[in-house]
């Protein structure tokens, strides 16, 4: 038997993946657990095996179909259960009625690239991955630039309040190495959260032109 409180949190990537984390502060010894997804009106259900991510939390990804297929919409409710094996039977450890479009977390933006770089500015573009057509243009982005001698946590956040998949970074220092990251969030959903940060894009500004001798 398992004692203690548990937390069961899931997010939908807006296409064909529900990622779940289950935390349990009681001890679970060599117990096999899984997440089971049962939509209210779809003719499929799905299961994934919970794998440990720390001493008291487990995670898994429910793969609902091909990455870009629209497996759930705003009309769906999915019953999500954590099931753990107890001898020959399964015990329900946690349950929630999950509204996918109220619990969104998109995939991190991809394909970051430098479009144009100068001494003091750099134009960068990116793409969103596996994002539903339902959002149309209702997305926002946050970006951050890592300057030499600083940490990511110290980097100021730049907010793009519209679906804009590029940014022009200004007031950069010439001949300097920088890194850049971006993340995305739909405007929809009460419990929607930011995507993970993208993989960092490294770039270097151009050196300043040498002044003429006087």
């Amino acid at each position: 038997a398992v004692n203690g409180t548990s937390q069961f949190t899931c997010f939908y990537n807006s296409r064909a993946n529900i990622s779940c984390v289950w935390s349990q502060d009681g001890a679970l010894q060599d117990t096999s657990c899984q997440v089971h997804a049962w939509p209210d009106r779809r003719r499929w259900n799905q299961t994934c095996e919970l794998l440990p991510v720390s001493q008291a939390s487990w995670a898994c990804n429910l793969i609902l179909g091909a990455p870009d297929s629209q497996k759930l919409t705003t009309v769906d409710i999915v019953t999500l259960r954590v099931l753990c094996r107890e001898g020959v039977r399964w015990r329900v450890m946690a349950i929630q009625d999950f509204k996918p479009f109220e619990n969104l977390r998109l995939m991190a933006p991809i394909s970051l690239q430098v479009v144009h770089v100068e001494t003091h500015r750099c134009n960068i573009s990116w793409e969103i991955s596996q994002a539903s057509h339902y959002f149309e243009r209702h997305l926002e982005f946050e970006a951050r630039t890592l300057s030499p001698g600083h940490t990511w946590e110290e980097a100021p956040l730049l907010t793009l309040k519209q679906k804009q998949e590029w940014i022009c970074l200004e007031t950069l220092t010439p001949d300097t190495q920088y890194e850049f990251q971006v993340r995305v969030k739909p405007l929809q959903g009460e419990f929607t959260t930011w995507s993970p940060w993208s993989q960092p894009l490294a770039f270097r500004t151009k050196p300043a032109a040498l002044g003429k001798d006087t």
């Epitope: 209210d40 009106r41 003719r43 629209q70 919409t73 009309v75 339902y134």
Partner: antibody, heavy 116, light 107 residues
Amino acid sequence: QVQLVQSGAEVKKPGASVKVSCKASGYTFSRYWINWVRQAPGQGLEWMGEILPGSGSINHNEKFQGRVTMTRDTSTSTVYMELSSLRSEDTAVYYCTRHYGSFDYWGQGTTVTVSS
Amino acid sequence: DIQMTQSPSSLSASVGDRVTITCKASQNVGTDVAWYQQKPGKAPKSLIYSASYRYSGVPSRFSGSGSGTDFTLTISSLQPEDFATYFCHQYSSYPFTFGQGTKLEIK
């Protein structure tokens, strides 16, 4: 086997209300949305709304908001659809249908005639 | 609301013919489209869900395809019992909507 059996034909006067029943059998009643769809004579299909018997959750077509009431009785596995303030344009066959995949099983239909 | 525009509205064909009915959604509906067959005085009968999945008991001559905004119902070889009216239906977002129907008649 899955069956949805609806109540009989009704004749109503304008301004009155009608309550149509849909009794489900052959599956777990609480688990699947029951939708209501109507079809005026010689016309297409029009979605009115849906109810999830287990929770009582309801979604309406805004066109009918305020005029349609959907309820359920889990003890008899029956769903009800009441339409008020009837007018001649509400003359139609009213169907209940289960949503699983799409509308997979349909009731036989209930003819509602609104006439003065 | 999402409009489902079906074409043609009526169609004359013969037994053995291959028939195609199309449905165009006014917005992207993914694959959340179904097809129904209705005969006079009867309730609709479910044929296809999720654009291309046949319900059990539906003959293999019925097939559906499409995604996004363009959908097709194909009857590969018409049988006498196939003469009826066919409706497409989107259940991607509220309110659910139907095409206006295609009446398939004997030539």
